[in-house]
């Protein structure tokens, strides 16, 4: 929908004559009739398919036409159309003489025509006026014209309807081409979708108007990116709503059970070492000189009988002192002043004198160690067995007892579980870290493909004429039970009509 606008600017008829050459009396009182129609290569009479318009008398003989002429006429002249502008047109402008006030065609003398011009061509929709001037032997007409779209119509041929709005159905204005231009804060095809607060979480937040962020259940925070833990969750967090993942040192469904009483309450006194031993439970290992559940009580240091080999203990301000019996020395009388003559080496150890007999050293036989060969050597202390193998002391040597699936001196070799072909019925064996897996052929299942799976031979509905189908589980084939009047392996032949075999 649009308007063809014609602006008449100046008409010159210096001699004041009609087209017939006859002069007007007293002068040519001039008005115009305009006919707008579809494009014609040669403009011919006929219906004004795009519209017509007439002016009142605009002047006598020669005159300039004002913008928006008085006397009820309008300049520019408006020729509205309610269709897609085709881009081409034909235009006929006739100047007529009006002897009286009645401008109807039937009221005018037959020779009242002053001049007639006809043009045709292309015209694109736009705001710019095209200026034209048409001259005949006696007259000259200067005018301009253009096509513009009606309100709410846009595009190259005024075919796009667009009406700006700011309501539930959309928030937009219209661009010159008729496309929607969303108002700030709105998006989407019809600008119905608000643009949420910048950074609002795409899944956990939403908005009903621009620049807000409403949180879905279980989420909170300015950008709805913080989950709300389970109600009752005390010392825990969440990564999705209503979770309760316990902080370190806490346990239980609501993370309210204290598993790290030592850290949270520091119950052990006097530098004792604290060990957690369950919920709200702990053990204090006291430093020498202290006792009590929390090592809160100070001991006499001699109470623990620190002096060995019959040494006597004497309390002192800064600790204690051991008085050793003959033949012993050291802080706790733990060292002996024995010599080889006292046979100090056990388990067949050989004694060697040192420092002119003031000291000795024991040379121990295999499997024994210690300063007096008093300790048996444990060859398993270094955990030599790999893959969970068990270490066994065997006299002077050791051996590893391997877990199933492993072999070698130290259980370091992995036995292939597939070596003994465990998969039945042609199943394919796959070695896994902790065992094996069988991939079974069609018709078999189970961990070792040992179970025969029946194939439903009736699934393809092979029986005709409403016959009942049965699967023979032993051969995976079907059998058709024919209704009365039909025969054949599929019940495909009516009785009495022999099958027409090709032989």
């Amino acid at each position: 929908s649009g308007v063809f606008q014609l602006q008449l600017q100046e008409f010159i008829n210096e001699r004041g004559v009609l087209a017939s050459g006859r002069p007007c009396e007293p002068g040519c009182r001039t008005f115009f009739r305009v006919c707008l129609k579809h494009f014609q290569a040669v403009v011919s009479p006929g219906p004004c398919t795009f519209g017509t318009v007439s002016t009142p008398v605009l002047g006598t003989n020669s005159f300039a036409v004002r913008d928006d002429s008085s006397g009820g006429g309008r300049n520019p002249l408006q020729l509205p159309f309610n269709f897609t502008w085709p881009g081409t047109f034909s235009l006929i402008i006739e100047a007529w003489h009006a002897p009286g006030d009645d401008l109807r065609p039937e009221a005018l003398p037959p020779d009242a025509l002053i001049s007639k011009i006809a043009i045709q061509g292309s015209l694109a929709v736009g705001q710019n006026w095209l200026l034209d001037e048409q001259t005949s032997t006696l007259t000259r007409l200067r005018y301009s014209y253009r096509v513009i779209c009606s309100d709410n119509y846009y595009g190259d041929n005024c075919s796009r309807l667009c009406k700006k709005r700011n309501d539930h159905f959309g928030h937009y204005v219209c661009q010159p081409d008729g496309n929607l231009s969303c108002l700030p804060g709105w998006t989407g095809e019809y600008c119905q979708q608000p643009i949420c607060l910048s950074g609002c979480h795409e899944q956990n937040g939403y908005c009903s108007k621009p620049a807000e962020c409403l949180c879905r259940p279980g989420w909170q925070g300015r950008l709805c990116n913080e989950c709300i833990p389970h109600n009752g969750c005390r010392h825990g967090t969440c990564s999705t709503p209503w979770q309760c993942t316990c902080d370190e040192g806490w346990g239980g469904l609501f993370c309210d059970q204290d598993l790290n009483y030592c850290t949270h309450h520091s119950p052990c006194k006097n530098g004792a070492t604290c060990s957690n031993s369950g919920q709200r439970s702990y053990t204090c290992t006291c430093r020498p000189g202290y006792t009590g559940v929390d090592c809160e009580l100070e001991l006499s240091e001699c109470d623990s009988n620190p002096c060995r080999n019959g040494g006597s203990c004497k309390d002192q301000e800064d600790g204690y002192h051991c008085l050793c019996p003959p033949g012993y020395y050291g802080l706790h009388c733990e060292h002996s002043t024995l010599s080889c003559a006292d046979s100090p080496c056990f388990n067949g150890g050989s004694c060697r004198e040192r420092n002119q007999g003031a000291n000795y050293a024991c040379e121990c036989p295999p499997n024994f160690t210690g300063s007096n060969c008093e300790k048996k050597v444990d060859r398993c202390t270094s955990n030599p067995c790999a893959n969970g193998g068990q270490c066994l002391n065997r006299g002077p040597s050791r051996m590893c007892r391997c877990r199933p699936g492993f072999t070698g001196t130290y259980c370091e070799l992995h036995v292939s579980d597939c070596a003994r072909n465990p998969c039945a019925h042609g199943g394919t064996c796959h070695d896994l870290e902790n065992g094996l897996m069988c991939t079974c052929p069609a018709g078999f299942s189970g961990r070792r493909c040992e179970v025969r799976t029946s194939i439903d031979a009736c699934a393809s509905s092979p029986c005709f004429n409403r016959a009942t189908c049965y699967t023979d589980l032993s051969t995976d084939t079907f059998v058709c039970n024919c209704p009365y009047g039909f025969v054949g392996s599929r019940c495909e032949f009516p009785v009495g009509l022999p099958p027409s075999f090709p032989w």
Epitope: C213, L214, P229
Partner: nanobody
């Protein structure tokens, strides 16, 4: 049953101070962001301040910035609003609430609400 109970309101002269408290029960207070909202006489509710669940992030409306301080004690299930340099325009019923939605300046939709405490600033 969820309950938010505000206290600490009263009549105070311009330039004076008040401390509002909000005690929560019926839900795990320490898991929720909290907010103070006020309704001046004859007007709609306006957001005052907010604090995140752990207490590490605080937010204030421009009108109270620098004068009011929000804080919380999760062990006591209590939210606080320390109001200094009070002005007559701070007169309102003050509510504590759990924010559910935020606008460009602060929260504007809420889940749980208290019943409110009246603060009047007048000479």
């Amino acid at each position: 049953e969820v309950q938010l109970v505000e206290s600490g309101g009263g009549l105070v002269q311009p330039g004076g101070s008040l401390r509002l408290s909000c005690t929560a029960s019926g839900f795990t207070f320490g898991n929720y962001d909290m907010s103070w909202v006020r309704r001046p006489p004859g007007k709609g509710p306006e957001w005052v301040s907010a604090i995140n669940s752990g207490g590490g992030s605080t937010y204030y409306a421009d009108s109270v910035k620098g004068r009011f301080t929000i804080s919380r004690d999760n062990a006591k299930n209590t939210l606080y609003l320390q109001m200094n340099s009070l002005k007559p325009e701070d007169t309102a019923v003050y509510y504590c609430a759990t924010p559910r939605g935020w606008g460009p300046t602060g929260p504007h939709e809420y889940g749980y609400w208290g019943q409110g405490t009246q603060v009047t600033v007048s000479s």
